[in-house]
Interface confidence: low
């Protein structure tokens, strides 16, 4: 059984067109992985944080399109580290429908460099590791441009990065990695 949480970057670093593509990607991946024992949740972050649906809410309404369609982009600064902490503490929580013995999988979709975040990755990644959260990172748009961004994606992801980091130049290219991500998650579930 897997509990899969999406953490999506809705900050000003994401152009609106790519944000729409991110939503399509999430819906499609959810459809592809939708088995009776897989639950999904989703949080969007910028300098604000919005839980769009919890595992419990997904269980009550397991319709990816209807859950993802109403999401609108927050805009603002890019507080990725705080977002990761919130997912680990709030979404992967039994009060929100997370299951004690399920695999915890976090899929972070981000433009790369965090900005203005009071927390660093060193504040949040060890906690995610302790909680057994397997982290996949998808860098969109600008994330593939700079070495600093690439380094950041590697820091967020579980080790080794080559198995947990995907990079796409734009939202359109997200389609190309849907199957790769699905295969990796199926492999975790055995």
């Amino acid at each position: 059984d897997s509990d899969i949480a999406f953490l999506i970057d809705g900050s000003g670093s994401i152009i609106p067109h790519d944000f729409r593509r991110m939503k399509e990607f999430v819906s499609t991946v959810m459809e592809q992985l939708k088995k009776s024992k897989t639950l999904f949740s989703l949080m969007q972050y910028s300098e604000e944080f919005r839980i769009h649906f919890t595992f419990k809410e997904f269980q009550n309404n397991p319709n990816p399109r209807s859950l993802v369609k109403p999401i609108t982009q927050l805009l603002g600064r890019t507080h990725t580290a705080t977002g990761i902490r919130k997912v680990v503490r709030e979404l992967f929580n039994i009060t929100n429908g997370a299951r004690k013995n399920a695999f915890k999988i976090l899929v972070v979709i981000t433009a790369g460099e965090k900005f203005g975040d009071p927390l660093g990755y060193e504040d949040v990644i060890p906690e995610a590791d302790r909680e057994g959260v397997i982290r996949y990172v998808i860098g969109v748009g600008d994330a593939s441009r700079s070495e600093k961004s690439r380094q950041e994606l590697n820091t967020i992801a579980s080790k080794p990065p080559r198995d947990h980091v995907f990079q796409v130049n734009n939202g359109e290219a997200l389609k190309t990695i849907q199957n790769q991500l699905r295969e990796k998650i199926f492999a975790i579930e055995g």
């Epitope: 000003g12 603002g76 600064r77 460099e113 900005f115």
Partner: nanobody
Amino acid sequence: DVQLVESGGGLVQPGGSLRLSCTASGFTFSNYAMNWVRQAPGKGLEWVSVISSSGSRRNYADSVKGRFTISRDNAKSTLYLQMNSLKPEDTAVYYCAKVRDAGYYRWNLNDLDYRGQGTQVTVSS
């Protein structure tokens, strides 16, 4: 009224350097990410570089990466573009441009609302 005034352009030989400046007024400069864009003869507007409001974050178009450096002095409300190893294909009118919304780190041309009158950069031997 928002005003952006670019300066520092000129004629330079390939491999040479220039430093462009953009002086801003009419808005709280330190609250806004700023961009440099350029327009080569007969071409459309091309994004060059962006810097965040605080100056801690920057990005560059692939075509200028490693050669151009964007910076800002919020106390002077001035934006800079240091251009090194200039090439003939860098010939263009360079404009500084303000992001529409305060606090947003944006470089999509659709998100820029004001730009200056531009400064001509010509790279030729």
